[in-house]
Amino acid sequence: HTAAQDNCTCPTNKMTVCSPDGPGGRCQCRALGSGVAVDCSTLTSECLLLKARMSAPKNARTLVRPNEHALVDNDGLYDPDCDPEGRFKARQCNQTSVCWCVNSVGVRRTDKGDLSLRCDELVRTHHILIDLRHRPTAGAFNHSDLDAELRRLFRERYRLHPKFVAAVHYEQPTIQIELRQNTSQKAAGDVDIGDAAYYFERDVKGESLFQGRGGLDLRVRGEPLQVERTLIYYLDEIPPKFSMKRLT
């Protein structure tokens, strides 16, 4: 839970307050909104970032439905409850005692209920499909060059191991990045695919969460790759539970 001692900032999360009050006078950074100490050598969890971002505009995330089990986030931003490790609590409630269950990326996966609603476990989002449309270019990007560049980006910028980048699909102008990470595959210290996808989403919108690093400058063989829209699909290890009423 430390950052650079020299200027005491958090390289991986600008939405923090840092001071040299850690052990031995080391820099310690706490997330805005929650006050939770964060590890500045890796990505901060999406729950803590959302909590810190409550002053940001609504509808920051748009979701679509790739199949019958995919989730649509119609609820916009909310002030989440995070557990001591910074993960979303399985049950989220608003100030009017309306409650619902969420998955590991904080998207609602049940109908809304009251305080009696039970959410037994935090269901893991194990498959994320990032759907991008790039701005027109002189010609199509070479698929293998694009694949390599995106895998490099997720490795070097978000510290996500390439084994979790299942595939990169390309049909100009649409790029799809598939991230897969089952509970059994995620070892201690591994970046969560949900956190990597969230950082990437903010980066392509020009809202980088990194401190001091430049914004995202994606290039494929020197040609700029400029994203004009992003859609993210989330699939959970256990399908969501919505009533038929919601589906009509």
């Epitope: 500045c40 490795r155 510290r159 690093r213």
Partner: antibody, heavy 119, light 108 residues
Framework: QVQLQESGPGLVKPSGTLSLTCAVS?????????WSWVRQPPGKGLEWIGE???????SYNPSLKSRVTISVDKSKNQFSLKLNSVTAADTAMYYC????????????WGQGTLVTVSS | DIQMTQSPSTLSASVGDRVTITCRAS??????LAWYQQKPGKAPKLLIY???SLESGVPSRFSGSGSGTEFTLTISSLQPDDFATYYC??????????FGQGTRLEIK
């Protein structure tokens, strides 16, 4: 026990191409590790050259990038280094190593092979 | 690129001494730092990764600490087998991998 073994010519002429191969045993080259080359000029420190992942993703030291190619041969469980346009400054002990983690630290090393660039 | 600077360049010590080697990064690298031991004519050997995690099979007299820009390798009680050259290496995600210039630990 993971073992790495470098092989290749010990003498290369200036402006020529240095070619080395690293045979891996005790681990599959298709495992989720990185396969790196590191060099050490006589009496000097260590310099990372570059690395490859089994899928073909490569990462190179920017100072050498224009001259380096690292490739992988999954069928032979080995990976290779090519460094072209060599000069006397490329004379060094060349090590292959297995990189662990998302960005590599090196948990297994070959014993090294000395390459001299001289006419 | 991130520069890694080790100090001292040479260290003279006796068996049983407690010794500390310092490694400084030119910018914050979190805890993405490894330490290696190298003996003449041999390949480097991993001692510590992620600043303070001891590699399997490495004696517990070796320990690492630090984060951000300043790191230390400590040998709590020097053994005859420990006289060697020690290197630090950063593996931060936004920079090519770089090593320190080395610290030679010699018998006093």
């Amino acid at each position: 026990q993971v073992q790495l073994q470098e092989s290749g010519p010990g003498l290369v002429k200036p402006s020529g191409t240095l070619s080395l191969t690293c045979a891996v045993s005790g681990d599959s080259i298709s495992s989720h590790n990185w396969w790196s080359w590191v060099r050490q000029p006589p009496g000097k420190g260590l310099e990372w050259i570059g690395e490859i992942y089994h899928s073909g993703i490569t990462s190179y030291n920017p100072s050498l990038k224009s001259r380096v190619t690292i490739s992988v041969d999954k069928s032979k469980n080995q990976f290779s280094l090519k460094l072209n346009s060599v000069t006397a400054a490329d004379t060094a002990m060349y090590y292959c190593a297995r990189g662990s983690g998302v960005i590599s630290y090196f948990d297994y090393w070959g014993q090294g092979t000395l390459v001299t660039v001289s006419s | 690129d991130i520069q890694m600077t080790q100090s001292p360049s040479t260290l003279s010590a006796s068996v049983g001494d407690r010794v500390t080697i310092t490694c400084r990064a030119s910018q914050s690298i979190g805890n993405w730092l490894a330490w290696y031991q190298q003996k003449p004519g041999k390949a480097p050997k991993l001692l510590i990764y992620k600043a303070s995690s001891l590699e399997s099979g490495v004696p517990s007299r070796f320990s690492g600490s630090g984060s951000g820009t300043e790191f230390t390798l400590t040998i709590s009680s020097l053994q005859p087998d420990d006289f060697a050259t020690y290197y630090c290496q950063q593996y931060d995600s936004y920079s090519p991998i770089t090593f320190g210039q080395g610290t030679r630990l010699e018998i006093k």
